[in-house]
Interface confidence: medium
């Protein structure tokens, strides 16, 4: 999986993270997980293996299987949303995933607009993180 190493957005704003995956994983469950440790992070939202979007409170996820990209959006950002998150794909055996650091700039601070993934901030997952799914 490829995704941005970090994204930043202002408090009360929103951010979008795009995670790209290789051919063959189109119909697998995609998820967005919070926590520093890959093996104990908490899944906030996941697809059902289809392109149908899912929404859970302030977080939504949508999988574009043609482009092999799933998109996570977090809205109404709070300071305590700042953390390490993971884009992941559930499969038999260890899941695939890549880490994304979410930075929330306090309201009133000089903050940049929410960054979207570009080639310069893409982190390629090379298998160093393994997560056993439930």
């Amino acid at each position: 999986i490829q995704g941005p190493e970090s994204v930043r957005a202002p408090e009360q704003g929103s951010l979008t993270v795009q995670c790209h995956y290789k051919q063959g994983w189109e119909t697998y469950i995609k998820w967005w997980c919070r926590g520093v440790r890959w093996d104990t992070c908490k899944i906030l939202i996941e697809t059902r293996g289809s392109e149908q979007g899912e929404k859970s409170d302030r977080v939504s996820i949508k999988d574009n299987q043609k482009d092999r990209t799933f998109t996570v959006t977090m809205e109404g950002l709070r300071r305590d949303d700042a953390d390490v998150y993971w884009c992941g794909i559930e499969r038999r055996g260890p899941d695939l995933g890549t880490q994304v650091k979410v930075i929330v700039d306090p309201e009133g601070a000089a903050s940049t607009t929410a960054s979207s993934p570009t080639n310069s901030n893409m982190a390629v997952f090379i298998g160093s993180h393994k997560r056993n799914h439930y």
Epitope: L44, G53, S56, S60, Y134
Partner: antibody, heavy 114, light 107 residues
Framework: QIQLVQSGPELKKPGETVKISCKAS????????LHWVKQTPEKNLKWMAW????????TYADDFKGRFAFSLETSSNTAYLLINNLKNEDTATYFC???????WGQGTTLTVSS | DIVMTQSQKFMSTSVGDRVSVTCKAS??????VAWHQQKPGQSPKTLIY???YRYSGVPDRFTGSGSGTEFILTISNVQSEDLAEYFC?????????FGGGTKLEIK
């Protein structure tokens, strides 16, 4: 804001058919899945199905295969639950829900009695 | 099917108290558990998802914990408006299933 508004209460006889509607607003209808949940008079909740609002394809619980049909009218942002050949045990309140663990409709009470 | 068991059908508490509603899954469901609150004559309202995440607008006196097969909804500093029935629900595998509910009574 997001709202799911369901049709009003229904009183039917055994063997009849009922169609319950769930009209969504406040978001793009085809973006998120919709679910149907049955609540019995004893207050037990039973998940019936989820509907892919992009394709219209339902995923059913085994108990709700056969007499139950789930459909969409995307032009009006409305989901429908059709129950054929009604039985007394269909007496319940039926809820539509957005992506399951999220927003719920107000419920439609169905009474089946001869 | 995964059976979600809420062994206490009724719980009685007083305003200001702390109460814990328990739920046990017949199989490992990871953390894919939600808690719903249903007040008399109303539709359910989702309080907690992914075991411990509170929905926006849900008071922080509601907290969820657990993983695997054992889950707890804790209400600290119970208020009179918390009079309701509380349902756990797993969404780890089809069919999604609910607990039988725990009715909270305020003394």
């Amino acid at each position: 804001q997001i709202q799911l508004v369901q049709s009003g209460p229904e009183l039917k006889k055994p063997g009849e058919t009922v169609k319950i509607s769930c009209k969504a607003s406040g978001y793009t209808f085809t973006d998120y899945s919709l679910h149907w949940v049955k609540q019995t008079p004893e207050k037990n909740l039973k998940w019936m199905a989820w509907i892919n609002t992009e394709t219209g394809a339902p995923t059913y619980a085994d108990d709700f295969k056969g007499r139950f049909a789930f459909s969409l009218e995307t032009s009006s942002n409305t989901a429908y639950l059709l129950i054929n050949n009604l039985k007394n045990e269909d007496t319940a309140t039926y809820f539509c829900a957005l992506t399951m663990v999220n927003y719920w409709g107000q419920g439609t009470t169905l009474t089946v009695s001869s | 099917d995964i059976v979600m068991t809420q062994s206490q059908k009724f719980m009685s508490t007083s305003v200001g108290d702390r109460v814990s509603v328990t739920c046990k899954a017949s199989q490992n469901v990871g953390i894919r558990v939600a808690w719903h609150q249903q007040k008399p004559g109303q539709s359910p309202k989702t309080l907690i998802y992914s075991t411990s995440y509170r929905y926006s607008g849900v008071p922080d006196r509601f907290t969820g914990s657990g993983s695997g097969t054992e889950f707890i909804l804790t209400i600290s500093n119970v208020q009179s408006e918390d009079l309701a029935e509380y349902f756990c629900q797993q969404y780890n595998s089809y069919p999604y299933t609910f607990g039988g509910g725990t009715k909270l009574e305020i003394k």
